[in-house]
């Protein structure tokens, strides 16, 4: 006899990285017929929603109109059908960005390198932080974490054309409070003609704002949140 229902999916729209004072919606997707959804923040009950009619709704949304450092942290959700509760969802790390300062990102030896070259990114921020994060724009939200007093090094190793793309870095004041993003660095890796033509590449984005990137990770996968790559989320833990 089943004692619990399957865990729901949890995600943030437009993204789990939210600029301060901007809005974000936490989504929780359970099953049709769920009469109650609970959102927990840092282990305590944060909000409740009772969908109507429950048999036609399998997803609820919890809206945060004004992101700040107090709202940043770990969220999870559960739902119930009748008296039976679900397993808790995976943890969603909601991060507030655009805090305090802007780091500078540089790449060694440079932004246009030959295939096989060893490439290292350097993220520098002179204010009080010791953790840095390097993100490659794209659907899978590649994230690396680095440490240092004023800078961190992110060695990519010998690069291939698959490393092409746009990178940014953040200083992290704690796991859930990040700096403004650095200016982007676009890495171009040139190889043999055959290699280049076959190279996998993350989707490219309009060069307007960082917000464009913030919209990509989950919205590209909204039809099936089971596919959502938790690389960045897991890294925070």
């Amino acid at each position: 006899q089943q004692q619990t229902l399957p865990k729901p999916f949890i995600w943030a729209e437009p993204h789990f990285m939210v600029p301060k004072e901007k809005q974000v919606t936490i989504c929780c997707q359970g099953n049709y017929g769920a009469v109650e959804y609970q959102l927990h923040f840092e282990g305590s009950l944060f909000a409740v929603d009772r969908p109507k009619p429950p048999e036609r709704i399998n997803k609820v949304q919890f809206y945060i109109p004004d992101m700040n450092s107090r709202m940043a942290g770990q969220y999870s959700c559960i739902y119930r059908v009748g008296e039976l509760w679900s397993e808790p969802s995976n943890l969603l790390d909601l991060v507030v960005t655009e805090m305090y300062d802007t780091p500078t990102l540089s790449v060694h030896p440079g932004p246009e390198v030959i295939s096989g070259e060893k490439v290292t990114f350097y993220c520098r921020l002179d204010t009080a932080t010791s953790m840095f994060l390097l993100l490659k724009e794209g659907r899978s939200s590649h994230v690396q974490r680095g440490y240092g007093k004023v800078q961190a090094e992110f060695p990519l190793g010998p690069v291939t054309t698959a490393h092409r793309g746009t990178y940014r870095c953040f200083g992290s004041y704690n796991n859930h409070a990040w700096s403004f993003p650095s200016e982007p660095v676009k890495l171009l890796v040139t190889g043999d003609i055959e290699n280049t033509s076959l190279a996998p590449e993350d989707p490219t984005f309009p060069a307007d704002t960082w917000g464009t990137y913030l919209l990509t990770t989950e919205t590209g996968l909204q039809k099936d949140h089971a596919l959502w790559d938790h690389t960045a989320q897991n890294l925070l833990r």
Partner: antibody
């Protein structure tokens, strides 16, 4: 054309500090890593470290971490290396070199070197 | 740190002779190796990078080869202007490290 200009010589006393300069011209200073290399009289070359002029990011040879401090002044396109607590072991020729920004280990341009003499 | 052992430390060769200088790394450096030439009183000049790639403007008599820990610089036919010091540099790992140098003179 690309030039890295360094003063020909510096004479300093033991225990003092010195700030060696490398003025770049003929290219976008902030786009290339600048390296510093030491050569003692009649001896080989030693890599001290490198700095990115745009970000100020650095990478030092551990051996020189407490000896050398690399900085830049973007407004004058000048890279600096400060050497502290000087001893006779620091007497050497110091070169700045611009690395190609598409391949490591390819030092495209070198300064003519500054001969540092530490003597009382 | 990776140690680069260069040999010979000095050598004499005749004009037109084929000259080979070797560099051995204390570990595999994955062909991340450059060769430099330095003439007396002058700054070094890069000849080869990535073990075998010739820098633009460097005469084709210079060539580089090797992999793993063992690398060599060859001058196919020695010319008078080739006299000077030659250094290898590994840049597989920080800190970059140079070989001890080879002094090449005309016999």
């Amino acid at each position: 054309q690309v030039q890295l200009q360094q003063p020909g010589a510096e004479l300093v006393k033991p225990g003092a500090s010195v700030k060696l300069s490398c003025k770049a011209s003929g290219y976008i200073f902030t786009s290339y890593w600048m390296h510093w290399v030491k050569q003692r009289p009649g001896q080989g070359l030693e890599w001290i470290g490198m700095i990115h002029p745009n970000s100020g990011s650095t990478n030092y040879n551990e051996k020189f971490k407490s000896k050398a401090t690399l900085t830049v002044d973007k407004s004058s396109s000048t890279a600096y290396m400060q050497l502290s607590s000087l001893t006779s072991e620091d007497s050497a020729v110091y070169y700045c070199a611009r690395e190609g920004n598409w391949a490591r280990g390819y030092f495209e341009y070198w300064g003519q070197g500054t001969t540092l003499t530490v003597s009382s | 740190d990776i140690k680069m052992t260069q040999s010979p430390s000095s050598m004499y060769a005749s004009l037109g002779e084929r000259v080979t200088i070797t560099c051995k790394a204390s570990q595999d450096i994955n062909s991340y190796l450059s060769w430099f030439q330095q003439k007396p009183g002058k700054s070094p000049k890069t000849l080869i990078y990535r073990a075998n790639r010739l820098v633009d403007g460097v005469p084709s008599r210079f060539s580089g080869s090797g992999s793993g820990q063992d690398y060599s610089l060859t001058i196919s036919s020695l010319e008078y202007e080739d006299v000077g010091m030659y250094y290898c540099l590994q840049y597989d790992e920080f800190p970059y490290t140079f070989g001890g140098g080879t002094k090449l003179e005309i016999k």
